[in-house]
Amino acid sequence: RAPRCRELPAQKWWHTGALYRIGDLQAFQGHGAGNLAGLKGRLDYLSSLKVKGLVLGPIHKNQKDDVAQTDLLQIDPNFGSKEDFDSLLQSAKKKSIRVILDLTPNYRGENSWFSTQVDTVATKVKDALEFWLQAGVDGFQVRDIENLKDASSFLAEWQNITKGFSEDRLLIAGTNSSDLQQILSLLESNKDLLLTSSYLSDSGSTGEHTKSLVTQYLNATGNRWCSWSLSQARLLTSFLPAQLLRLYQLMLFTLPGTPVFSYGDEIGLDAAALPGQPMEAPVMLWDESSFPDIPGAVSANMTVKGQSEDPGSLLSLFRRLSDQRSKERSLLHGDFHAFSAGPGLFSYIRHWDQNERFLVVLNFGDVGLSAGLQASDLPASASLPAKADLLLSTQPGREEGSPLELERLKLEPHEGLLLRFPYAA
């Protein structure tokens, strides 16, 4: 008799794929645009990325460092009107994209949470949560919570409001901290909180260290749902050299949890390559005309248009990974087991019950390596086969779909492999 199927876990929408942050509407849209109406016109692009949620803003009125002139219920007229926002929400819903609103109060000021009047600010946030939930928002983000006194208790209160309205609403908190203990203390009292931090930014881009950071985090957080990013707001290129961007995309999409990206991460947008652009939020490169300041500074392969036409581009990889992440049970909610594969490598298995299983092998080093996969590290429920089919490689030149012998697996420098194999009873 066939074994009984394992009961599926309850899945919220943010469990099913990536979140996409647009902190700066003007930089994202470019060409002097930068409002909610213009963003509505970019929703088809977000759909093509298969992202599940858009983390937007902050877009509320904020007079720098002035509590009285900060209104979390009002949209800054530079970004549009409440009607524009409602229209964006409706269009996003039609395309199955959820909208998460950033309510970090003093985003234009010295301290994101003001240095005084904590209770006044907290009350404003509470009122804003209730107002925007009624307006149809799917969740909220608050950043720089290390600057918020008694953050844990405020987050717990805001979480109660959000969840009280509907279990289908999300609260994201962001911190600049990379310290695991600080992160855990924030998570402790907030069961369903999604926390973005700089935790992985200290990975130093080595396989061993990244493996140890990921496994420590997962062990420490137990069975709670995680999010994966390298910071609460910055681009991946702020932390990674170009040759590791593909590897990290593969990793972020295949770890257990919600991957969170910033606009431009999908094309490797890099502020340092665009002289005169704010490093805080460089202009999104839709095509070569997006950055007219310096003729020739932007080549087609740096842009959305150019990369969309190239199946080997970073953007094409992002789209493929996002698609796999949103439809494969083992990647959606499968178990995770990391195991040894040799120095410089990080490898793990994702598996769920009798569904197709996935093996990820990442070479962080700048030399080619043979993977010595130590299957003995794995539990019986996650054993490795002799061969697995190559679903994709982060480097061009491999024949996809071909079976690879796992004992003879060789990886190019900075190469990541995603392999699939069937469940075997």
Epitope: D179, D202, G204, L240, M279
Partner: antibody
Framework: EVQLVESGGDLVKPGGSLKLSCTAS????????MSWVRQTPEKRLEWVAY????????YFPDTVKGRFTISRDNAKNTLYLQMSSLKSEDTAMYYC????????????WGQGTLVTVSA | DIVMSQSPSSLAVSVGEKVTMSCKSS????????????LAWYQQKPGQSPKPLIY???TRESGIPDRFTGSGSGTDFTLTISSVKAEDLAVYYC?????????FGAGTKLELK
């Protein structure tokens, strides 16, 4: 009080190489982005290299790109600047500087180490 | 690259006098997304490394006396010392950190009359 101590400066011939070190103490080195800034004999300040906290991301101005590399050993709390194909215009006092978060402005500087490139 | 121009290149003052020095950038340093101005000021005394005075164009670094004031936004900036003390004699540099590469002005040297 944050402390940054540079070393390795020397007199070197054009075309030569040199490696500078900066030892950091009294702060969580591995969580800060770092830079090297130099000051020419004419007292002009010029940023020459950046490295992110984890060491993954590095930036250089065009004047040194391809000749200088920046690295760090977080276990040893040490920042490095490897300079090769040195030119006379690289003669300067080299400072290691801690950044404010990820913004390249510099609240903390070392005392500097002098590099002289001359035949 | 953003070019930073400082004037005057030197300034002779008497103790107790009010002094202002200027810094101009070749493009705006005001980022519209957060309304912050990405400009810093440093003081450098002979034989010492630069010391931070001001960041975000007008925020004093901790421990800096309130006689030092930074002002301006967009492309025109000013550092004012309300009443110069003998210990303020130094070279003052402005620096933009709006975009890569970060760039410095050539400095204004404050000397005694």
């Amino acid at each position: 009080e944050v402390q940054l101590v540079e070393s390795g400066g020397d007199l070197v011939k054009p075309g030569g190489s040199l490696k500078l070190s900066c030892t950091a103490s009294r702060f969580a080195f591995s969580t800060y982005d770092m830079s090297w800034v130099r000051q020419t004999p004419e007292k002009r300040l010029e940023w020459v290299a950046y490295i992110s906290s984890g060491g993954g991301s590095t930036y250089f101005p065009d004047t040194v790109k391809g000749r200088f590399t920046i690295s760090r050993d977080n276990a040893k709390n040490t920042l490095y600047l490897q300079m090769s194909s040195l030119k006379s215009e690289d003669t300067a006092m080299y400072y290691c500087a801690r950044q404010d978060g990820h913004y390249p402005w510099f609240p903390y500087w070392g005392q500097g180490t002098l590099v002289t490139v001359s035949a | 690259d953003i070019v930073m121009s400082q004037s005057p290149s030197s300034l002779a003052v008497s103790v107790g006098e009010k002094v202002t020095m200027s810094c101009k950038s070749s493009q705006s340093l005001l980022y519209s997304g957060n309304q912050k101005t990405y400009l810093a000021w440093y003081q450098q005394k002979p034989g010492q490394s630069p010391k931070p005075l001001i960041y975000w164009a007008s925020t004093r670094e901790s421990g800096i006396p309130d006689r030092f004031t930074g002002s301006g936004s967009g492309t025109d900036f000013t550092l004012t010392i309300s009443s110069v003390k003998a210990e303020d004699l130094a070279v003052y540099y402005c620096q933009q950190y709006y975009s890569y590469p970060p760039t410095f002005g050539a400095g204004t040297k404050l000397e005694l009359k």
